[in-house]
Interface confidence: low
C-alpha cells in the first residue's frame, strides 16, 4: 500500500490556444487530469488501473503551480494503490480548458484538451522527486513525482506491513526497511520476549516484564540460582530444590541433631581433649592438675586431705608431700608410733588397738574425721558430685545439687540409662551412646559390679624383715606386724636406727 | 477478553477421519495467524499445523503431512483442522492457539482444547 504523488509547477500556453489551434476565450482556464496505470510499451487507452485524479482550475493560460500540501491542498496529487508497487508504471497527464464551472468530462466539448503527455517507465519506492519537463509544440509543462508508503507500509515495494506497538503482542518501533526494531528491554522476532534481570538463571528463573528475576518452584535469590531446601531443614543444604543434605557433623533427617558437640561449643577447658560421645553428648580427658566435667576446675592434689592424723600437705610439682605430726609416718602419715595408751583419738573419739597392740585405730563421733577424729567433717571438701553437681553441706550430712541430666547421690548417673541403678555395690554408672558402662570399686567387677573379687594386699609380700602381713579388707591395705627389733610400715627399720622423720 | 474454543473431538477407528473446528472471539480474526497443537499424555507438546492471517502461508508437522489440511473461514472467524487416516498415536488433546500476530511465530493464547482418541 503506497501513493504515487504528482506535483505540477508550472505550465506554459503563451498563447493561449487549445490542442486544435483555436483560441480560448477570453483565456484557456487551465486544469488538469491524471490517469496512472500498469506500465505499457506504447501508453494507450483504457482502464486507469493504478487510478485518476482531476485539479480544479488552476490558472490561466501560463501559470506556476503552487505546492499546496502544507495547507491542506491538492499539489501534489495523490495516487493512492493498496497492492505491492510493481516498480513501473504508465503516466498519462491532460491539460483542459474550462469554459464553465463544470469539470466533468461529459459537460466539456471534446475539443477543449490543451495538451496530452504520456510517459512509461520505472519508479523505485522512495522519498526523492523525480522532475520532468515535457514540450509540445504549443506547450510546456514542469512537474515531479514520487511513490512513497503508506503510513505502516515499508520496503522496495510498500508490501511490508509493520506498525509500531507497545503492548502483549509486541514491543517495537519500525525501522525504514519494515524490520521490527525492539524497544530497550525486550527481545525475540517480535519483540514480545522480555530481557530479564542480567544473570537470572536460565534455567530456573524467568521474567513477565524487563530486568525482573522471578523464581520458578524450588528456587530463590535475586538470580533465582539458590534452590530451596526441604522446610525445616536445620544445617544443610540442597544442589536440587526440596532437598536436604547434612553439613559436615550434623545428623537426622533435618540436619538437626549435633554429632560434631566438641568441634561446635569446644565445651572442654584448660586443654583438656574432648571426644564426642553421640548426639550432644561429649567426655573431656582434663590435663593433670584439673577436675570437673568440663575441666573448669583446678585441682589441687591436696584437696582431697590425703594426710592422716593431722599430717600437713604440701604441693609438689609432680604430686604431694605429707609432713607428719610427733608419733607418725608414712606416705599419708598413716602409720602411728602411738598406741591407745597415748589417748591418740581427739572431740571423744574412741580408741581400738590394732595388730596386738602394735597401732590403733580411732571411731569417731558424729561431724568428726581423721585417723585421730582431729577434723570437724566440710562433707563437700573433697568434691563428692560428679559432672558438675553442687555440693552442699546440711549439718552433719551434704547433699549434691546435679546439673539437668544427671541425677544420683553424687550425680554420678545419667539421667537416660543409669537412672535405674543398675550398677550394683556402688559401682559408678555411665551413659553411653549406646548402652552404660558401670565402672566398679575395688573388689568388685562385671558388667554390672555384681561378682565380688577379693583384693589381698598382702599379695605382692610388702612386708621386710618375715614381719607378718595381714589384709585390712575395710580399707584394702596391708598392715605389718614386726618381729622384735624392727620398726617402720613395712618393719624396714631396725631398732636403734630411728627413721630420719622430716620434722 | 480473547477466546479460542475448540470442538469436533471424538472417538474415532484407526484410518476414519475428523474435522475440528477452532472458533475465535475477541480480536481481529483478520490479523492474525491461528494454529493447531497436540499433548499426549505424558508427552511434550507438539505444534501440528498453522495458518497465517492471510491463509497464504500454512504449516505442517512431518508427522501429519499430506492426512491433515487446515483453513480458515474470515468471515466466520473460525479455524478447521480436517484429519484424515488418523492413527492410534494422533490420540492427544488438540489445542487451537494464536502467537496474537499474523505469521506463525510462536503461542499467545490457546483455547481449552478437544480430546482426540483413535481406537486401533
Known amino acids: 500500500s503506497g501513493v504515487f504523488q504528482l506535483q505540477l509547477q508550472e505550465f506554459i500556453n503563451e498563447r493561449g490556444v487549445l490542442a486544435s489551434g483555436r483560441p480560448c476565450e477570453p483565456g484557456c482556464r487551465t486544469f488538469f487530469r491524471v490517469c496512472l496505470k500498469h506500465f505499457q510499451a506504447v501508453v494507450s487507452p483504457g482502464p486507469c488501473t493504478f487510478g485518476t485524479v482531476s485539479t480544479p482550475v488552476l490558472g490561466t493560460n501560463s501559470f506556476a503551480v503552487r505546492d499546496d500540501s502544507s495547507g491542506g491542498g491538492r499539489n501534489p496529487l495523490q495516487l493512492p494503490f493498496n497492492f505491492t508497487w510493481p516498480g513501473t508504471f504508465s503516466l498519462i497527464i491532460e491539460a483542459w480548458h474550462a469554459p464553465g464551472d463544470d469539470l466533468r468530462p461529459e459537460a466539456l466539448p471534446p475539443d477543449a484538451l490543451i495538451s496530452k503527455i504520456a510517459i512509461q517507465g520505472s519508479l523505485a519506492v522512495g522519498q526523492n522527486w523525480l522532475l520532468d519537463e515535457q514540450t509540445s509544440t504549443l506547450t510546456r509543462l514542469r512537474y515531479s513525482y514520487r511513490v512513497i508508503c503508506s503510513d505502516n507500509y515499508y520496503g522496495d515495494n510498500c508490501s511490508r506491513l509493520c506498525k509500531k506497538r507497545n503492548d502483549h503482542f509486541g514491543h517495537y518501533v519500525c525501522q525504514p526497511d519494515g524490520n521490527l526494531s525492539c524497544l530497550p528491554g525486550w527481545t525475540g522476532e517480535y519483540c514480545q520476549q522480555p530481557i530479564c534481570l542480567s544473570g537470572c538463571h536460565e534455567q530456573n528463573g524467568y521474567c513477565s516484564k524487563p530486568a525482573e528475576c522471578l523464581c520458578r518452584p524450588g528456587w530463590q535469590g535475586r538470580l533465582c540460582n539458590e534452590c530451596i531446601p526441604h522446610n525445616g531443614c536445620r544445617h544443610g543444604t540442597c544442589s536440587t530444590p526440596w532437598q536436604c543434605t547434612c553439613d559436615e557433623g550434623w545428623g537426622g533427617l533435618f540436619c538437626d541433631q549435633d554429632l560434631n558437640y566438641c568441634t561446635h561449643h569446644s565445651p572442654c577447658k584448660n586443654g583438656a581433649t574432648c571426644s564426642n560421645s553421640g548426639q550432644r553428648s561429649y567426655t573431656c580427658t582434663c590435663r593433670p592438675g584439673y577436675t570437673g566435667v568440663d575441666c573448669e576446675l583446678e585441682l589441687s592434689e591436696c584437696d582431697s586431705n590425703p594426710c592422716r592424723n593431722g599430717g600437713s600437705c604440701k604441693d609438689q610439682e609432680d604430686g604431694y608431700h605429707c609432713l607428719c605430726p610427733p608419733g607418725y609416718y608414712g606416705l599419708h602419715c598413716e602409720h602411728s608410733t602411738l598406741s591407745c595408751a597415748d589417748s591418740p583419738c581427739f572431740n571423744g573419739g574412741s580408741c581400738r588397738e590394732r595388730n596386738q597392740g602394735a597401732n590403733y585405730a580411732c571411731e569417731c563421733p558424729p561431724n568428726f574425721t581423721g585417723s585421730n577424729c582431729e577434723k570437724k567433717v566440710d562433707r563437700c571438701t573433697s568434691n563428692p558430685c560428679a559432672n558438675g553437681g553442687q555440693c552442699l553441706n546440711r549439718g552433719p550430712s551434704r547433699m549434691c545439687r546435679c546439673r539437668p541430666g544427671f541425677t544420683g547421690t553424687y550425680c554420678e548417673l545419667h539421667v537416660s540409662d543409669c537412672a535405674r541403678n543398675p550398677c550394683a555395690h556402688g559401682g559408678t554408672c555411665h551413659d553411653l551412646e549406646n548402652g552404660l558402662m558401670c565402672t566398679c570399686p575395688a573388689g568388685f567387677s562385671g558388667r554390672r559390679c555384681e561378682v565380688r573379687t577379693s583384693i589381698d594386699a598382702c599379695a605382692s609380700s610388702p612386708c621386710f624383715n618375715r614381719a607378718t602381713c595381714y589384709t585390712d579388707l575395710s580399707t584394702d591395705t596391708f598392715v605389718c606386724n614386726c618381729p622384735y627389733g624392727f620398726v617402720g610400715s613395712r618393719c624396714e627399720f631396725p631398732v636403734g636406727l630411728p627413721p630420719s622423720f622430716p620434722w | 477478553e480473547v477466546q479460542l474454543v475448540e470442538s469436533g473431538g471424538g472417538l474415532v477407528q484407526a484410518g476414519g477421519s475428523l474435522r475440528l473446528s477452532c472458533a475465535v472471539s475477541?480480536?481481529?480474526?483478520?490479523?492474525?495467524?491461528i494454529g493447531w497443537f497436540r499433548q499426549a499424555p505424558g508427552k511434550e507438546p507438539e505444534g501440528i499445523s498453522c495458518i497465517s492471517s492471510s491463509g497464504g502461508i500454512t504449516y505442517y508437522a512431518d508427522s501429519v503431512k499430506g492426512r491433515f489440511t487446515i483453513s480458515r473461514d474470515n468471515a466466520k472467524n473460525t479455524v478447521y483442522l480436517q484429519m484424515n487416516s488418523l492413527k492410534p498415536e494422533d490420540t492427544a488433546v488438540y489445542y487451537c492457539a494464536t502467537p496474537g500476530i499474523a505469521a506463525c511465530r510462536g503461542i499467545h493464547y490457546t483455547g481449552q482444547g478437544t480430546q482426540v482418541t483413535v481406537s486401533s
Open positions: 475477541g480480536f481481529s480474526f483478520d490479523d492474525y495467524a
